[in-house]
Interface confidence: low
């Protein structure tokens, strides 16, 4: 049992908090006041409008990320990168594997509630990242399919198919009905791409562009 | 919606046999592996017996080697699981599953059916 408090020591706490609540206002507004007097005497026009700035972007992509992990670029102090907390980075773009199984239409909507579509893939660098965060026995959906089941690979940010930036199973693509891509493991050929069927569930990989701020 | 559908469960004997099949809606199994997966009550679902299509090597687990056999019908498009000397131990609700290699784990197979009950009374 927690003793109930008795009155006077009730309203001498409630004075000690009423007293801290005061002293850290003043203590805000005396900093305040400080900041103003400097920036009246020193012209910070230009770091006022970059925080300000700042913080209407993050503002922005509050709704899909409550939490970024940013990064200094560089050696200037005024430029950061931003991916949304826990995803992780490779050069210019954020990375999230999708655990959930889901059909690709499914996969690339939960994607895009995330600000983010599926992986498209440009570079064997950046394939090679994206493996190292992929479990072996499990397949997942990358941003590419033939709606048309002709043969017209596209991938969902419109970039261009590049048959000679592909990285098919050997074999692979090999049926018209399968007009989805994944990416999964094979002992003979390690990591490749494999096309299947679009609503059969699968893992996935989000791709967005990093936050600048 | 692709789905796969289960069929043949029922109740049995101990020592007695029962066939189930498991036909796909709304897709071919070719290049697929195929599962065929179990979950009793109170306990978790396991992989039974698997097939991989694209080059029909068949897995079974340890418990029901011997007595139960994977195998494909092409021309139906139909996977079944032949039962044979069926044990108390066997009654659970089987499923079918596809993924694209044997040894995905349960959670990483896809297209799950509603699963056909097979009990087996002593």
């Known amino acids: 049992m927690v003793p109930e408090e008795e009155p006077q020591d009730r309203e001498k706490g409630l004075w000690w908090f009423q007293l801290k609540v005061w002293s850290m206002a003043v203590v805000s507004i005396l900093l305040l006041s400080v900041c103003f007097t400097v920036s009246s005497v020193v012209p910070h026009n230009f770091m006022y409008s970059k925080t300000v700035k700042r913080l209407s972007k993050l503002r922005e992509y509050q709704q899909y990320h409550p939490s970024l992990t940013c990064v200094m670029e560089g050696k200037d102090i005024e430029d950061w990168s931003c991916c949304p907390t826990p995803w992780t980075s490779f050069q210019s773009s954020c990375y999230f594997i999708s655990t959930g199984m889901q059909s690709w239409t499914k996969s690339q909507k939960n994607c895009s509630v995330m600000g983010a579509d599926l992986v498209v893939i440009n570079t064997r660098e950046e394939q090679d990242f994206i493996i190292q965060n992929l479990k072996r026995n499990s397949s997942y959906f990358l941003g590419l399919s033939d709606p048309g089941g002709r043969r017209h690979w596209q991938w969902v940010d419109q970039t261009p198919y590049n048959e000679n930036v592909t990285f098919w199973h050997s074999g692979e693509p090999n049926n018209l009905d399968e007009r989805c891509a994944i990416i999964n493991f094979r002992s003979s050929e390690e990591w490749g791409w494999n096309d299947i069927h679009c609503h059969v569930p699968q893992k996935s990989i989000c791709k967005m562009k990093k936050i600048y701020i | 919606q692709v789905q796969l559908q289960e069929s043949g469960g029922g109740l049995v004997q101990a020592g007695d046999s029962l066939r189930l099949s498991c036909a796909p809606s709304?897709?071919?199994?070719?290049?697929?592996?195929i599962g065929w997966f179990r979950q009793a009550p109170g306990k978790e679902r396991e992989k039974v017996a698997c097939?991989?299509?694209?080059?029909?090597?068949?897995y079974y687990e340890d418990s029901v080697k011997g007595r139960f056999t994977i195998s494909s019908d092409t021309a139906k498009n139909t996977i079944h699981l032949q039962m044979n000397s069926l044990k108390p131990d066997d009654t659970a609700v089987y499923y079918c599953?596809?993924?694209?290699?044997?040894?995905?784990?349960?959670?990483?197979?896809?297209?799950w059916g509603q699963g056909t009950q097979v009990t087996v009374s002593s």
């Open positions: 599953a596809a993924a694209w290699e044997c040894d995905y784990a349960p959670a990483d197979f896809g297209s």
């Open positions: 709304g897709f071919t199994f070719d290049g697929y592996a």
């Open positions: 097939i991989n299509k694209s080059d029909g090597l068949t």
